[in-house]
Structure formats: C-alpha cells, structure tokens
Interface confidence: low
C-alpha cells in the first residue's frame, strides 16, 4: 500500500487555536456539557478507522462548525479562518487517500461520528459551534495521538 500522507503543520494549527482558546471558551455558556465527549468516543477508535473518523471530523468542522460560527472579532476570525483553511487542506489530502481505497468507513467509525453530530444537534446552533470550537484541542490532541497511524496506511 502507498503511504497516506498529510503534510499539514499541526503545530501551526495548535498555535492558532491556543491564541483564541481562552476567548472562545469564555463564550461557552454550558461548560459541563461536551460535544466531542472529551475523547471518550474517540478513545475506542481502532487504527483501521482512524482515517475515516479523521475525514468525518474534518467534515464536521468544515461543513458545520466553521459555517455555524459567527465571529464578530476580526482577530479571532482570522485565526479561525486559518484553522479552517488547514482543515480544508487536510480534507484534500484525505480525499487522495480515499481514491487509493485507504480510507474505508466501517460501521464503528460512522457510529462514533454520529454521536458527535447528535451531541451538536442538541444545542442551539451558535452555542454548539462555540462549544465545538472550544473543544478543538480534543480533536487536535486525538490527531496527534494517532499521528503515525493516520499518516501511514
């Protein structure tokens, strides 16, 4: 199998997020509720499903979270746009993996992301977007944890 590479600078994404994390999380009015389930849902993902879950979570952030969030602060908006662009780039790379049939989605992977979508759906749309942005570190930590698995099929 050919290697499935993602040449995105994760450190740059993490830095961008750290700069806005406090401001975003301060707007979260429901701190005792989680959408990404503090990695519980993601912990049980098997190596075989990492690519699919990553693809699905990138789509979750690009198609829903970044679209639903309305940021009035231009400084924060620039950082979010930067993260969104990095995610779009990662999506493009994973699409190539799919074309190489290295990103198959099994039922377990689909179920894991459905839980996250269901959690998101229970919140008022802007509150859900804020919370999901505030939990970006959960997703980023998970990507880092599964780095080797994800980047080499």
């Amino acid at each position: 199998l050919r290697r499935c590479l993602i040449s995105t600078d994760m450190h740059h994404i993490e830095e961008s997020f750290q700069e806005i994390k406090r401001a975003i999380q301060a707007k979260d009015t429901f701190p005792n509720v989680t959408i990404l389930s503090t990695l519980e849902t993601l912990q049980i993902i098997k190596p075989l499903d990492v690519c699919c879950v990553t693809k699905n979570l990138l789509a979750f952030y690009v198609d829903r979270v970044f679209k639903d969030h309305q940021e009035p602060n231009p400084k924060i908006l620039r950082k979010i746009s930067s993260i969104a662009n990095s995610f779009l780039y990662m999506q493009k790379t994973l699409r190539q993996c799919q074309e190489q049939r290295q990103c198959h989605c099994r039922q377990e992977a689909t179920n894991a992301t459905r839980v996250i979508h269901d959690n998101y759906d229970q919140l008022e749309v802007h509150a859900a977007a804020i919370k999901s942005l505030g939990e970006l570190d959960v997703f980023l930590a998970w990507i880092n944890k599964n780095h080797e698995v994800m980047f080499s099929a």
Epitope: T29, D121, Q122, E124, H126
Partner: antibody, heavy 122, light 112 residues
Amino acid sequence: QEQLKESGGGLVQPGGSLKLSCKASGFDLSSYGVSWVRQAPGKGLEWIGYIDPVFGSTYYANWVNGRFTISSDNAQNTLYLQLNSLTAADTATYFCARGSGYVYYGYTYDLWGPGTLVTVSS
Amino acid sequence: DIVMTQTPASVEAAVGGTVTIKCQASQSIYRYLSWYQQKPGQRPKLLIYGASNLASGVSSRFKGSGSGTEFTLTISDLECADAATYYCQSYYYSSSSGYGNVFGGGTEVVVK
C-alpha cells in the same frame, strides 16, 4: 420570587398589529432562553418561537411565516412579541415561558407567565 | 417537522386509581420530552423533563418513561387535584429538521 408577567393583549381588528410584553422579575432574563407559546380558547398549546439568550438569535415555528417577531430588551428585563397581519385564527392566550437552565433541557419550560388574551375580531 | 400524537384525548378514572397517557413522536427525539399539567384558566406546570426526570416540587406519583418515539406518563394514586389536561412536548433540536418545540394535542384527565 421568580416571575413572568405578560401584558399588551386586547381586542384588535383583522389585519391589525399588536405588541405583547413579557416582564421578568426575580431573575435576569438575558441568562435564559425564552419562548412564546399560545393557546386558542378550548384548544391545546402551540409553540410560536424562541430567543436565545447568548446570541440573541430567534427561531420560529414554520407556521409563523414571518408574521410574528420576538425581541428582547435586557436593560428592561423584558421580552416582546410583535404580532402582525392578525386574523381570527390568532385569537388566543399568549404565554411567555422560560427555558430551564440545563442545556439539554433548554427548551423545556420551568416558569410560565399567566398569559395575556388577544382577541382578533371586527 | 416533528409531530407529537397524544392518546387518549380524554380519560376518566377514580380517586386512588391509575392513569396512563401515551405520546408518540413522528421521529426519534431521544429522551427530549417533557410533560406538563394545565388546569382550566391556569398556566401550564412542568411535571417531567428528559422523559423521566421529575421537576422540582412535583409529586412522585407522576412517572415518565420512554425514549425514541414512544413515551408514557403514569399518574398513580389519583387525587381530585390531578384533574387537568396533560401535554407532552418534544424539545429535540436537529440542524436538519430545526427546532422541535412541539406539543401533543393534550389529554384531559377526569377524576371521579
């Protein structure tokens, strides 16, 4: 004591407009999601719409069709419902109701006003 | 839109008896369901939220159960004061179907 009190109801002609108020006391209205719900005489409860406390976003039942508008004035601790293009079918008691404080139960209503009657008739 | 169907429309029972009211959702609303009690000329009162959680100050004679599309409110040891109309309410939010703040048609409970 936490209370909600609606006002502004009354007799209005078909095609007319009316603005209802919902005054909160004993708590800060801006900390809660609040809905308007109506009840036609002898009929069931019908959800009209909701205003989100954090973003001020408003959501309406599909049947509202742009005729009603929810707004709030945090300084006055008051919620409003603007009723336009009224017909006899809009004759009802209009309640404001506070969403409970839990996010997953955010659209269940733990505090209701006594209601204000709107009668649309010529 | 979510549709909430409540049955029966009316039920009669004796003091000390038990009444069961059913509520069916047109699609899964998980456990996002409330029950309210409303007496003539009064505002509704929250009884149950989250399908089975008793609201503050509500008697344990009221019991909610169910999830998904089928829900039940059971009132045991009926008292005269329980004579009222009971409504179920879905409050499931889905980004695809929007706000599901929909009430059932109501069930009138008559206590003999």
